[in-house]
């Protein structure tokens, strides 16, 4: 499989980490999360095309079958392969609390 | 979250399980596996509208991203949330051994 | 630059009370959360507490329920706590913190020493 | 609440050492673990936050890891201006509480 940087389609076009400024405002968390008031979203994008970051056996399969049945067999899709943990502050009907999230920012990314 | 029956898109048109056949030669595996001959191979296939069988928060927040940014951010993906285990018999210098892939068939699927 | 200055140094009888400042500059003060952090002479950091200054919304460390109050002023970008019935044991220099991600302290003012003596 | 043990509560070494100071939990706190850095008369400062995620403005020779309940903040290779007290800090859950530190002193 080509590493993360060999992207066969140009710099940066391949499934890679990518980072969103998103207000609470944004994520629709206004009326639960008080803090932090804006989170450096990382996330997966980009596209997957033969072998790149294949995570499994199952992503080269989805690979081969897309190449014969592309109307019918979705390319890999870039996803994170695991993720940062996150605090947040949130409101609750006693006050506030805080909450810790282990599943909510990309840490690295692979195509599936 | 909507149930993974409940799609909003029309009856199977949202993520789910697809069972595709498909020969070894159709999976490029013609030159090193001897069985089986022929593979139900079982994919995630299908659309991921807002909130359909969300992996995790990751899987939210996307879909908030998605739909102030559509251009920037790409709509989740249906994926394996887990797989079903599978024996392959392979050629080998020696003559052939039996190996088991973990990784190789979707069991069932989410949006992420 | 973020910056917290806080108030000089005060010098109380045990059993008074004191009001310690911190003013938030080069940002937007309701941007960042406040936390108030203690720390005794050769000893280790004790949180005492954390502020939201949009609306002033606190959460105590339970050791410091009572001892502490914890208030903000919007106007004047400060932060303030108020230190009730000291004692000796109140004698420390305190921190003010700003956090932009409510997990760690990224921002710290210099402290204010705080002497509890008759 | 959580404690937090910190070890060794001194540490003399030789700029150019390769160091490695301990932060023990109480019980598992994944990745809730942020690192210190305080000198004499100064405030701290935030050096490693989330067990092992680097800081900007912070040297490369600081690093981080460890998750659950063992935690290590490493310098591999000991400069002059980094003599002073380390300091562990949990978020895992309120209330936010510290190590007793780590003097980092020379030998």
């Known amino acids: 499989a080509r590493n993360g940087d060999d992207c066969p389609l140009g710099p940066g076009r391949c499934c890679r980490l990518h980072t969103v400024r998103a207000s609470l405002e944004d994520l629709g968390w206004a009326d639960w999360v008080l803090s932090p008031r804006e989170v450096q979203v990382t996330m997966c994008i980009g596209a997957c095309p033969s072998q790149f970051r294949a995570a499994n056996m199952h992503a080269q399969i989805k690979t081969s079958l897309h190449r014969l049945k592309p109307d019918t067999v979705p390319a890999p899709c870039c996803v994170p392969a695991s993720y940062n943990p996150m605090v947040l502050i949130q409101k609750t009907d006693t006050g506030v609390s805080l909450q810790t999230y282990d599943d909510l920012l990309a840490k690295d990314c692979h195509c599936i | 979250a909507r149930n993974g029956d409940d799609c909003p898109l029309g009856p199977g048109r949202c993520c789910r399980l697809h069972t595709v056949r498909a020969s070894l030669e159709d999976l490029g595996w013609a030159d090193w596996v001897l069985s089986p001959r022929e593979v139900q191979v079982t994919m995630c296939i299908g659309a991921c509208p807002s909130q359909f069988r969300a992996a995790n928060m990751h899987a939210q927040i996307k879909t908030s991203l998605h739909r102030l940014k559509p251009d920037t951010v790409p709509a989740p993906c249906c994926v394996p949330a887990s797989y079903n285990p599978m024996v392959l018999i392979q050629k080998t210098d020696t003559g052939v051994s039996l190996q088991t892939y973990d990784d190789l068939l979707a069991k069932d699927c989410h949006c992420i | 630059q973020v910056q917290l200055q806080q108030s000089g140094p005060e010098l109380v009888k045990p059993g008074a009370s004191v009001k310690l400042s911190c003013k938030a500059s080069?940002?937007?003060?309701?941007?960042?959360?406040i936390n108030w952090v203690k720390q005794r002479p050769g000893q280790g950091l004790e949180w005492i507490g954390w502020?939201?200054?949009?609306?002033?919304?606190?959460k105590y460390n339970e050791k410091f329920e009572g001892k502490a109050t914890l208030t903000v002023d919007t106007s004047s970008s400060t932060a303030y706590m108020e230190l009730h019935s000291l004692t000796s044991e109140d004698s420390a220099v305190y921190f003010c913190?700003?956090?932009?991600?409510?997990?760690?302290?990224?921002?710290w003012g210099q402290g204010t020493t705080l002497t509890v003596s008759s | 609440d959580i404690v937090l043990t910190q070890s060794p509560a001194t540490l003399s070494v030789t700029p150019g050492d390769r160091v490695s100071l301990s932060c023990r939990a109480s019980?598992?706190?994944?990745?809730?673990l942020h690192w210190y850095q305080q000198k004499s008369h100064e405030s701290p400062r935030l050096l490693i936050k989330?067990?092992?995620q680097s800081i900007s403005g912070i040297p490369s020779r600081f690093s981080g890891s460890g998750s659950g309940t063992d935690f290590t903040l490493s310098i591999n290779s000991v400069e002059t201006e980094d003599f002073g007290m380390y300091f562990c800090?949990?978020?895992?859950?309120?209330?936010?509480?510290f190590g007793g530190g780590t003097k980092l002193e020379i030998k």
């Open positions: 019980q598992s706190i994944s990745y809730y």
């Open positions: 989330y067990a092992s």
């Open positions: 502020i939201y200054p949009r609306d002033g919304i606190s």
């Open positions: 080069g940002y937007t003060f309701t941007s960042y959360d």
């Open positions: 913190a700003g956090t932009s991600d409510p997990a760690y302290f990224d921002y």
């Open positions: 800090q949990q978020s895992n859950s309120w209330p936010y509480t």
